[in-house]
Protein backbone atom coordinates (compact mmCIF):
# COMPACT_ATOMS: atom_id res chain seq x y z
CA UNK A 1 0.00 0.00 0.00
CA UNK A 2 1.43 3.39 -0.96
CA UNK A 3 -0.13 6.48 0.51
CA UNK A 4 0.85 9.75 -1.08
CA UNK A 5 0.11 13.26 0.03
CA UNK A 6 -0.37 16.45 -1.89
CA UNK A 7 2.30 18.98 -2.64
CA UNK A 8 2.55 22.67 -1.76
CA UNK A 9 -0.06 25.17 -2.95
CA UNK A 10 -3.56 24.19 -2.11
CA UNK A 11 -4.45 21.56 0.47
CA UNK A 12 -3.06 18.09 0.12
CA UNK A 13 -5.30 15.09 -0.29
CA UNK A 14 -4.52 11.46 0.43
CA UNK A 15 -4.06 9.20 -2.57
CA UNK A 16 -3.62 5.44 -2.08
CA UNK A 17 -2.38 2.86 -4.57
CA UNK A 18 -1.83 -0.90 -4.36
CA UNK A 19 1.04 -2.67 -6.11
CA UNK A 20 -0.38 -5.28 -8.43
CA UNK A 21 0.33 -7.65 -11.29
CA UNK A 22 -1.10 -7.98 -14.76
CA UNK A 23 -1.65 -11.19 -16.67
CA UNK A 24 -0.29 -10.86 -20.24
CA UNK A 25 -3.06 -10.74 -22.83
CA UNK A 26 -5.78 -10.17 -20.26
CA UNK A 27 -7.21 -6.98 -18.75
CA UNK A 28 -5.64 -5.59 -15.61
CA UNK A 29 -6.49 -3.03 -12.93
CA UNK A 30 -4.11 -0.42 -11.56
CA UNK A 31 -5.70 0.45 -8.24
CA UNK A 32 -5.88 4.04 -6.94
CA UNK A 33 -8.22 5.71 -4.48
CA UNK A 34 -8.48 9.26 -3.14
CA UNK A 35 -10.59 11.38 -0.80
CA UNK A 36 -14.08 11.48 -2.35
CA UNK A 37 -15.34 14.71 -3.91
CA UNK A 38 -18.90 15.24 -5.12
CA UNK A 39 -17.80 17.93 -7.58
CA UNK A 40 -17.09 15.79 -10.61
CA UNK A 41 -16.41 18.95 -12.63
CA UNK A 42 -13.36 19.70 -10.44
CA UNK A 43 -11.80 16.23 -10.42
CA UNK A 44 -8.73 15.55 -12.54
CA UNK A 45 -7.17 12.08 -12.68
CA UNK A 46 -3.81 11.65 -14.39
CA UNK A 47 -2.00 8.36 -14.78
CA UNK A 48 1.66 8.59 -15.72
CA UNK A 49 4.34 5.96 -16.27
CA UNK A 50 8.02 6.38 -15.49
CA UNK A 51 10.03 6.61 -18.70
CA UNK A 52 6.99 7.29 -20.88
CA UNK A 53 6.67 10.75 -22.42
CA UNK A 54 2.91 10.97 -22.92
CA UNK A 55 0.19 10.35 -20.38
CA UNK A 56 -1.16 6.88 -19.70
CA UNK A 57 -4.63 8.32 -19.15
CA UNK A 58 -6.32 11.57 -18.18
CA UNK A 59 -9.85 12.16 -16.93
CA UNK A 60 -10.99 15.72 -16.38
CA UNK A 61 -14.22 17.74 -16.45
CA UNK A 62 -16.18 14.53 -16.27
CA UNK A 63 -14.70 12.84 -19.32
CA UNK A 64 -11.60 11.20 -20.75
CA UNK A 65 -9.08 13.70 -22.14
CA UNK A 66 -6.78 11.62 -24.31
CA UNK A 67 -5.07 14.20 -26.54
CA UNK A 68 -1.80 13.80 -24.58
CA UNK A 69 -2.03 10.02 -24.30
CA UNK A 70 1.06 8.03 -25.20
CA UNK A 71 0.78 5.85 -28.28
CA UNK A 72 1.55 2.62 -26.38
CA UNK A 73 -1.67 3.05 -24.34
CA UNK A 74 -3.95 4.20 -27.16
CA UNK A 75 -7.34 2.47 -26.96
CA UNK A 76 -6.30 0.36 -23.97
CA UNK A 77 -7.22 2.44 -20.92
CA UNK A 78 -10.37 3.45 -19.06
CA UNK A 79 -11.30 4.80 -15.64
CA UNK A 80 -14.47 3.83 -13.82
CA UNK A 81 -16.17 7.17 -14.48
CA UNK A 82 -19.29 6.33 -12.50
CA UNK A 83 -17.15 5.64 -9.40
CA UNK A 84 -14.97 8.75 -9.50
CA UNK A 85 -17.01 10.81 -7.02
CA UNK A 86 -16.58 8.12 -4.37
CA UNK A 87 -12.81 8.33 -4.76
CA UNK A 88 -12.08 5.55 -7.24
CA UNK A 89 -9.38 6.53 -9.72
CA UNK A 90 -8.41 2.98 -10.67
CA UNK A 91 -7.35 2.39 -14.24
CA UNK A 92 -8.47 -0.51 -16.37
CA UNK A 93 -5.73 -1.60 -18.74
CA UNK A 94 -6.82 -3.77 -21.63
CA UNK A 95 -4.69 -6.50 -23.18
CA UNK A 96 -1.77 -6.28 -20.75
CA UNK A 97 1.65 -6.45 -22.40
CA UNK A 98 4.98 -7.49 -20.88
CA UNK A 99 6.21 -3.93 -21.52
CA UNK A 100 3.45 -2.46 -19.34
CA UNK A 101 5.49 -3.36 -16.26
CA UNK A 102 6.97 -0.40 -14.39
CA UNK A 103 6.31 2.44 -11.99
CA UNK A 104 3.06 4.35 -12.43
CA UNK A 105 1.92 7.55 -10.75
CA UNK A 106 -1.72 8.25 -9.92
CA UNK A 107 -2.05 12.04 -9.69
CA UNK A 108 -5.30 13.58 -8.45
CA UNK A 109 -6.68 17.12 -8.32
CA UNK A 110 -10.04 17.84 -6.65
CA UNK A 111 -11.83 20.88 -5.24
CA UNK A 112 -10.12 20.01 -1.93
CA UNK A 113 -6.52 19.84 -3.17
CA UNK A 114 -3.92 17.69 -4.90
CA UNK A 115 -2.15 14.43 -4.19
CA UNK A 116 -0.34 11.53 -5.82
CA UNK A 117 1.01 8.06 -5.14
CA UNK A 118 3.21 5.63 -7.04
CA UNK A 119 2.39 2.05 -7.93
CA UNK A 120 4.66 -0.80 -8.97
CA UNK A 121 3.05 -2.85 -11.71
CA UNK A 122 4.46 -6.25 -12.59
CA UNK A 123 3.50 -8.19 -15.66
CA UNK A 124 3.76 -11.87 -16.44
CA UNK A 125 1.56 -14.86 -16.93
CA UNK A 126 -0.10 -17.04 -14.34
CA UNK A 127 -2.85 -19.61 -14.47
CA UNK A 128 -4.64 -22.12 -12.33
CA UNK A 129 -3.11 -25.61 -12.27
CA UNK A 130 -5.22 -28.71 -12.70
CA UNK A 131 -4.13 -31.99 -11.16
CA UNK A 132 -5.37 -35.27 -12.60
CA UNK A 133 -4.66 -38.93 -12.21
CA UNK A 134 -2.63 -40.13 -15.19
CA UNK A 135 -4.26 -43.44 -16.06
CA UNK A 136 -1.89 -43.99 -19.00
CA UNK A 137 1.12 -44.38 -16.73
CA UNK A 138 2.38 -47.76 -15.59
CA UNK A 139 2.30 -46.80 -11.89
CA UNK A 140 0.02 -44.53 -9.90
CA UNK A 141 0.91 -41.10 -11.34
CA UNK A 142 -0.42 -37.55 -10.99
CA UNK A 143 -0.17 -34.95 -13.72
CA UNK A 144 -0.26 -31.22 -12.91
CA UNK A 145 -0.85 -28.86 -15.83
CA UNK A 146 -1.05 -25.07 -16.02
CA UNK A 147 -1.44 -23.47 -19.46
CA UNK A 148 0.31 -20.07 -19.11
CA UNK A 149 3.22 -18.95 -16.93
CA UNK A 150 5.94 -16.31 -17.25
CA UNK A 151 8.63 -15.88 -16.05
CA UNK A 152 9.47 -19.57 -15.68
CA UNK A 153 8.12 -20.75 -12.34
CA UNK A 154 9.27 -23.35 -9.86
CA UNK A 155 7.11 -26.40 -9.26
CA UNK A 156 7.03 -28.19 -5.90
CA UNK A 157 4.96 -31.19 -4.89
CA UNK A 158 3.74 -31.76 -1.34
CA UNK A 159 1.58 -34.31 0.40
CA UNK A 160 -0.64 -34.22 3.46
CA UNK A 161 0.50 -37.59 4.74
CA UNK A 162 4.25 -37.14 4.10
CA UNK A 163 4.59 -33.54 5.26
CA UNK A 164 8.05 -32.11 4.62
CA UNK A 165 8.91 -34.88 2.16
CA UNK A 166 11.03 -33.94 -0.87
CA UNK A 167 9.35 -35.17 -4.04
CA UNK A 168 11.95 -33.84 -6.48
CA UNK A 169 13.35 -37.36 -7.03
CA UNK A 170 9.95 -38.80 -7.94
CA UNK A 171 8.65 -35.93 -10.08
CA UNK A 172 9.46 -34.55 -13.48
CA UNK A 173 8.65 -31.01 -14.64
CA UNK A 174 8.74 -29.62 -18.17
CA UNK A 175 8.09 -26.18 -19.67
CA UNK A 176 6.73 -25.89 -23.18
CA UNK A 177 6.80 -22.53 -24.97
CA UNK A 178 3.36 -21.41 -26.11
CA UNK A 179 2.69 -20.22 -29.66
CA UNK A 180 3.16 -16.50 -28.84
CA UNK A 181 6.76 -17.33 -27.76
CA UNK A 182 6.53 -15.68 -24.34
CA UNK A 183 4.42 -17.73 -21.98
CA UNK A 184 4.95 -21.39 -21.27
CA UNK A 185 2.82 -24.39 -20.45
CA UNK A 186 3.86 -26.09 -17.22
CA UNK A 187 3.55 -29.86 -16.90
CA UNK A 188 4.72 -31.71 -13.82
CA UNK A 189 4.33 -35.44 -13.22
CA UNK A 190 4.50 -37.09 -9.79
CA UNK A 191 5.20 -40.83 -9.64
CA UNK A 192 4.52 -43.49 -7.03
CA UNK A 193 1.55 -41.82 -5.41
CA UNK A 194 -0.41 -43.59 -2.70
CA UNK A 195 -4.15 -43.79 -2.27
CA UNK A 196 -6.03 -41.97 0.54
CA UNK A 197 -3.70 -39.01 0.41
CA UNK A 198 -3.96 -35.36 -0.65
CA UNK A 199 -1.24 -34.11 -2.99
CA UNK A 200 -0.52 -30.46 -3.83
CA UNK A 201 1.20 -29.12 -6.92
CA UNK A 202 2.58 -25.64 -6.13
CA UNK A 203 3.64 -23.38 -8.99
CA UNK A 204 5.31 -20.09 -8.16
CA UNK A 205 7.18 -17.21 -9.81
CA UNK A 206 7.84 -13.67 -8.56
CA UNK A 207 4.33 -12.59 -9.57
CA UNK A 208 1.98 -15.35 -8.50
CA UNK A 209 1.66 -18.54 -6.56
CA UNK A 210 -0.87 -21.20 -7.52
CA UNK A 211 -1.76 -24.48 -5.95
CA UNK A 212 -3.66 -27.44 -7.31
CA UNK A 213 -4.79 -30.06 -4.80
CA UNK A 214 -6.06 -33.55 -5.46
CA UNK A 215 -7.37 -36.07 -2.96
CA UNK A 216 -7.51 -39.64 -4.22
CA UNK A 217 -9.50 -42.27 -2.35
CA UNK A 218 -10.87 -45.67 -3.35
CA UNK A 219 -14.25 -44.19 -4.19
CA UNK A 220 -13.64 -40.63 -5.41
CA UNK A 221 -11.28 -37.92 -6.56
CA UNK A 222 -11.57 -34.38 -5.17
CA UNK A 223 -9.81 -31.38 -6.71
CA UNK A 224 -9.25 -27.82 -5.58
CA UNK A 225 -7.26 -24.94 -7.08
CA UNK A 226 -6.12 -21.62 -5.68
CA UNK A 227 -4.16 -18.69 -7.13
CA UNK A 228 -2.68 -15.77 -5.24
CA UNK A 229 -0.81 -12.72 -6.54
CA UNK A 230 2.37 -11.90 -4.66
CA UNK A 231 3.61 -8.50 -3.48
CA UNK A 232 0.23 -6.75 -3.41
CA UNK A 233 1.55 -3.88 -1.32
CA UNK A 234 -0.49 -0.72 -0.90
CA UNK A 235 1.11 2.69 -1.25
Amino acid sequence: LIIGFGISGRHSITVTTVASAGNIGEDGILSCTFEPDIKLSDIVIQWLKEGVLGLVHEFKEGKDELSEQDEMFRGRTAVFADQVIVGNASLRLKNVQLTDAGTYKCYIITSKGKGNANLEYKTGAFSMPEVNVDYNASSETLRCEAPRWFPQPTVVWASQVDQGANFSEVSNTSFELNSENVTMKVVSVLYNVTINNTYSCMIENDIAKATGDIKVTESEIKRRSHLQLLNSKAS
Epitope: E35, I38, K39, L40, G62, K63, D82, V86
Partner: antibody
Framework: EVQLQQSGTVLARPGASVEMSCKTS????????MHWVKQRPGQGLEWIGT????????NYNQKFKGKAKLTAVTSANTAYMDLSSLSNDDSAVYYC??????????WGQGTLVTVSA | DIQMTQSPASQSASLGESVTITCLAS??????LAWYQQKPGKSPQLLIY???SLADGVPSRFSGSASGTKFSFKISSLQAEDFVSYYC?????????FGGGTNLEIK
Protein backbone atom coordinates in the same frame (compact mmCIF):
# COMPACT_ATOMS: atom_id res chain seq x y z
CA GLU B 1 -31.03 -5.39 -1.81
CA VAL B 2 -30.44 -1.68 -1.13
CA GLN B 3 -33.08 -0.11 1.10
CA LEU B 4 -33.52 3.39 2.50
CA GLN B 5 -36.09 3.65 5.29
CA GLN B 6 -37.08 7.16 6.35
CA SER B 7 -38.65 8.33 9.59
CA GLY B 8 -42.33 9.26 9.76
CA THR B 9 -44.38 12.41 9.24
CA VAL B 10 -43.47 15.44 11.35
CA LEU B 11 -45.72 18.30 12.42
CA ALA B 12 -43.77 21.30 13.74
CA ARG B 13 -44.30 24.90 14.82
CA PRO B 14 -42.73 27.85 12.99
CA GLY B 15 -39.27 28.59 14.39
CA ALA B 16 -38.81 25.04 15.66
CA SER B 17 -36.27 22.44 14.50
CA VAL B 18 -36.84 18.89 13.29
CA GLU B 19 -34.60 15.90 12.76
CA MET B 20 -35.36 13.14 10.26
CA SER B 21 -33.52 9.90 9.68
CA CYS B 22 -32.71 7.58 6.81
CA LYS B 23 -31.81 4.02 7.85
CA THR B 24 -29.94 2.14 5.17
CA SER B 25 -29.23 -1.50 4.42
CA UNK B 26 -27.93 -3.66 1.59
CA UNK B 27 -24.75 -1.73 0.76
CA UNK B 28 -21.60 -0.30 2.35
CA UNK B 29 -22.96 2.83 3.98
CA UNK B 30 -19.54 4.44 4.42
CA UNK B 31 -18.61 4.16 0.75
CA UNK B 32 -21.24 6.25 -1.03
CA UNK B 33 -22.66 9.77 -0.94
CA MET B 34 -26.07 10.16 0.67
CA HIS B 35 -28.15 12.97 -0.81
CA TRP B 36 -31.21 14.82 0.42
CA VAL B 37 -33.87 16.24 -1.88
CA LYS B 38 -36.82 18.54 -1.10
CA GLN B 39 -40.20 18.52 -2.84
CA ARG B 40 -42.85 21.06 -1.94
CA PRO B 41 -46.48 20.01 -2.55
CA GLY B 42 -47.21 19.99 -6.27
CA GLN B 43 -43.71 21.31 -7.02
CA GLY B 44 -40.44 20.04 -8.45
CA LEU B 45 -37.34 18.53 -6.87
CA GLU B 46 -34.57 20.50 -5.16
CA TRP B 47 -31.17 19.12 -4.14
CA ILE B 48 -30.39 20.11 -0.54
CA GLY B 49 -26.94 18.59 -0.19
CA THR B 50 -24.98 15.43 0.39
CA UNK B 51 -22.81 13.67 2.96
CA UNK B 52 -20.10 11.04 2.54
CA UNK B 53 -20.50 8.91 5.68
CA UNK B 54 -16.99 7.45 5.41
CA UNK B 55 -15.42 10.78 6.41
CA UNK B 56 -18.47 12.99 7.15
CA UNK B 57 -17.58 15.29 4.25
CA UNK B 58 -20.58 17.41 3.25
CA ASN B 59 -21.54 19.60 0.33
CA TYR B 60 -24.60 21.86 0.55
CA ASN B 61 -26.69 23.75 -1.91
CA GLN B 62 -25.99 27.38 -0.93
CA LYS B 63 -29.73 27.93 -0.64
CA PHE B 64 -29.93 25.43 2.25
CA LYS B 65 -26.78 26.43 4.14
CA GLY B 66 -27.81 27.33 7.67
CA LYS B 67 -31.17 25.65 7.16
CA ALA B 68 -30.16 21.99 6.79
CA LYS B 69 -27.48 20.06 8.63
CA LEU B 70 -26.47 16.62 7.44
CA THR B 71 -24.91 14.01 9.69
CA ALA B 72 -24.34 10.26 9.63
CA VAL B 73 -23.87 7.59 12.28
CA THR B 74 -21.87 4.83 10.64
CA SER B 75 -22.39 2.32 13.44
CA ALA B 76 -26.13 2.52 12.77
CA ASN B 77 -25.88 2.86 8.96
CA THR B 78 -28.14 5.88 9.32
CA ALA B 79 -28.08 9.38 7.84
CA TYR B 80 -29.80 12.32 9.47
CA MET B 81 -30.98 15.75 8.40
CA ASP B 82 -31.78 18.57 10.83
CA LEU B 83 -33.89 21.46 9.63
CA SER B 84 -33.82 24.59 11.79
CA SER B 85 -35.82 27.84 12.12
CA LEU B 86 -38.79 26.26 10.35
CA SER B 87 -41.19 28.35 8.30
CA ASN B 88 -44.11 27.54 5.99
CA ASP B 89 -41.64 27.32 3.09
CA ASP B 90 -40.12 24.27 4.75
CA SER B 91 -43.38 22.30 4.50
CA ALA B 92 -42.43 19.58 2.03
CA VAL B 93 -41.57 15.96 1.49
CA TYR B 94 -37.86 15.30 2.07
CA TYR B 95 -36.17 12.34 0.40
CA CYS B 96 -32.88 10.66 1.17
CA UNK B 97 -31.39 9.14 -1.96
CA UNK B 98 -28.15 7.52 -3.04
CA UNK B 99 -26.45 6.01 -6.04
CA UNK B 100 -24.07 3.09 -6.23
CA UNK B 101 -22.84 4.54 -9.52
CA UNK B 102 -23.21 8.35 -9.12
CA UNK B 103 -26.80 8.70 -10.36
CA UNK B 104 -29.58 8.32 -7.83
CA UNK B 105 -30.81 4.75 -8.17
CA UNK B 106 -32.24 4.38 -4.68
CA TRP B 107 -34.71 6.62 -2.85
CA GLY B 108 -36.32 6.55 0.56
CA GLN B 109 -40.11 6.75 0.76
CA GLY B 110 -39.92 10.38 1.91
CA THR B 111 -40.61 12.19 5.17
CA LEU B 112 -43.46 14.71 5.17
CA VAL B 113 -42.79 17.82 7.23
CA THR B 114 -45.72 20.14 7.90
CA VAL B 115 -45.02 23.50 9.52
CA SER B 116 -48.09 25.05 11.09
CA ALA B 117 -48.89 27.36 13.97
CA ASP C 1 -25.47 27.14 -10.56
CA ILE C 2 -26.29 25.15 -13.68
CA GLN C 3 -29.88 25.79 -14.77
CA MET C 4 -31.78 22.87 -16.26
CA THR C 5 -34.60 24.18 -18.45
CA GLN C 6 -37.11 21.41 -19.02
CA SER C 7 -39.90 21.65 -21.58
CA PRO C 8 -42.78 21.35 -21.93
CA ALA C 9 -44.03 21.84 -18.35
CA SER C 10 -47.06 19.74 -19.25
CA GLN C 11 -48.16 17.76 -22.27
CA SER C 12 -51.31 15.97 -23.34
CA ALA C 13 -51.02 12.83 -25.42
CA SER C 14 -52.95 9.71 -26.32
CA LEU C 15 -52.24 6.08 -25.56
CA GLY C 16 -49.81 4.58 -28.08
CA GLU C 17 -48.42 7.96 -29.12
CA SER C 18 -44.80 9.05 -28.79
CA VAL C 19 -43.70 12.03 -26.73
CA THR C 20 -40.39 13.82 -26.35
CA ILE C 21 -39.30 15.95 -23.42
CA THR C 22 -36.21 18.14 -23.61
CA CYS C 23 -33.81 19.52 -21.06
CA LEU C 24 -31.37 22.32 -21.84
CA ALA C 25 -28.35 22.78 -19.57
CA SER C 26 -27.07 26.33 -19.08
CA UNK C 27 -23.49 25.08 -19.48
CA UNK C 28 -21.65 21.94 -20.50
CA UNK C 29 -22.36 18.89 -18.34
CA UNK C 30 -20.96 16.18 -20.62
CA UNK C 31 -23.38 13.29 -20.42
CA UNK C 32 -23.84 13.54 -16.66
CA LEU C 33 -27.61 13.67 -16.83
CA ALA C 34 -30.39 11.43 -15.55
CA TRP C 35 -34.13 11.21 -16.13
CA TYR C 36 -36.58 10.23 -13.38
CA GLN C 37 -40.23 9.27 -13.33
CA GLN C 38 -42.42 10.17 -10.37
CA LYS C 39 -45.86 8.76 -9.73
CA PRO C 40 -48.25 10.66 -7.42
CA GLY C 41 -47.38 10.15 -3.75
CA LYS C 42 -44.29 8.08 -4.63
CA SER C 43 -40.54 8.63 -4.70
CA PRO C 44 -38.82 9.40 -8.01
CA GLN C 45 -37.50 6.41 -9.92
CA LEU C 46 -34.42 6.40 -12.15
CA LEU C 47 -35.20 5.70 -15.81
CA ILE C 48 -32.16 6.91 -17.76
CA TYR C 49 -28.60 7.58 -16.56
CA UNK C 50 -25.53 8.98 -18.31
CA UNK C 51 -27.94 10.68 -20.76
CA UNK C 52 -28.64 7.58 -22.84
CA SER C 53 -28.39 4.41 -20.71
CA LEU C 54 -31.51 2.60 -19.61
CA ALA C 55 -31.68 1.77 -15.89
CA ASP C 56 -32.27 -1.85 -14.85
CA GLY C 57 -35.82 -3.06 -15.28
CA VAL C 58 -36.97 -0.01 -17.27
CA PRO C 59 -39.00 -0.83 -20.41
CA SER C 60 -37.29 -0.22 -23.76
CA ARG C 61 -39.97 2.25 -24.85
CA PHE C 62 -38.06 4.82 -22.78
CA SER C 63 -34.91 6.31 -24.33
CA GLY C 64 -32.56 9.24 -23.95
CA SER C 65 -30.32 11.17 -26.30
CA ALA C 66 -27.82 14.01 -26.04
CA SER C 67 -26.51 16.73 -28.33
CA GLY C 68 -24.19 19.21 -26.68
CA THR C 69 -26.13 20.78 -23.83
CA LYS C 70 -29.51 19.64 -25.13
CA PHE C 71 -30.92 16.40 -23.80
CA SER C 72 -34.00 14.59 -24.99
CA PHE C 73 -36.15 11.93 -23.39
CA LYS C 74 -38.59 9.90 -25.47
CA ILE C 75 -41.41 7.52 -24.67
CA SER C 76 -42.14 5.69 -27.90
CA SER C 77 -45.54 4.15 -27.27
CA LEU C 78 -47.40 5.60 -24.30
CA GLN C 79 -49.00 3.20 -21.85
CA ALA C 80 -51.59 4.19 -19.25
CA GLU C 81 -49.03 4.08 -16.41
CA ASP C 82 -46.75 6.58 -18.20
CA PHE C 83 -49.05 9.56 -17.57
CA VAL C 84 -47.12 10.89 -14.59
CA SER C 85 -44.30 13.40 -13.96
CA TYR C 86 -40.75 13.35 -15.35
CA TYR C 87 -37.62 15.20 -14.26
CA CYS C 88 -34.13 15.62 -15.65
CA UNK C 89 -31.16 16.17 -13.35
CA UNK C 90 -27.49 17.06 -13.83
CA UNK C 91 -24.82 15.67 -11.54
CA UNK C 92 -21.78 17.21 -13.21
CA UNK C 93 -21.24 19.81 -10.51
CA UNK C 94 -22.78 21.03 -7.27
CA UNK C 95 -25.38 22.03 -6.55
CA UNK C 96 -26.95 19.15 -8.42
CA UNK C 97 -29.96 20.64 -10.18
CA PHE C 98 -33.23 19.29 -11.53
CA GLY C 99 -35.37 20.46 -14.40
CA GLY C 100 -38.74 21.94 -13.46
CA GLY C 101 -40.54 18.73 -14.41
CA THR C 102 -43.00 17.67 -17.10
CA ASN C 103 -46.47 16.44 -16.28
CA LEU C 104 -47.84 14.02 -18.89
CA GLU C 105 -51.63 14.02 -19.16
CA ILE C 106 -53.90 11.69 -21.04
CA LYS C 107 -55.73 13.32 -23.94
Amino acid sequence: EVQLQQSGTVLARPGASVEMSCKTSGYTFTGYWMHWVKQRPGQGLEWIGTIFPGNSDTNYNQKFKGKAKLTAVTSANTAYMDLSSLSNDDSAVYYCTMGLRTWLDYWGQGTLVTVSA
Amino acid sequence: DIQMTQSPASQSASLGESVTITCLASQTIGTWLAWYQQKPGKSPQLLIYAATSLADGVPSRFSGSASGTKFSFKISSLQAEDFVSYYCQQFYTTPWTFGGGTNLEIK
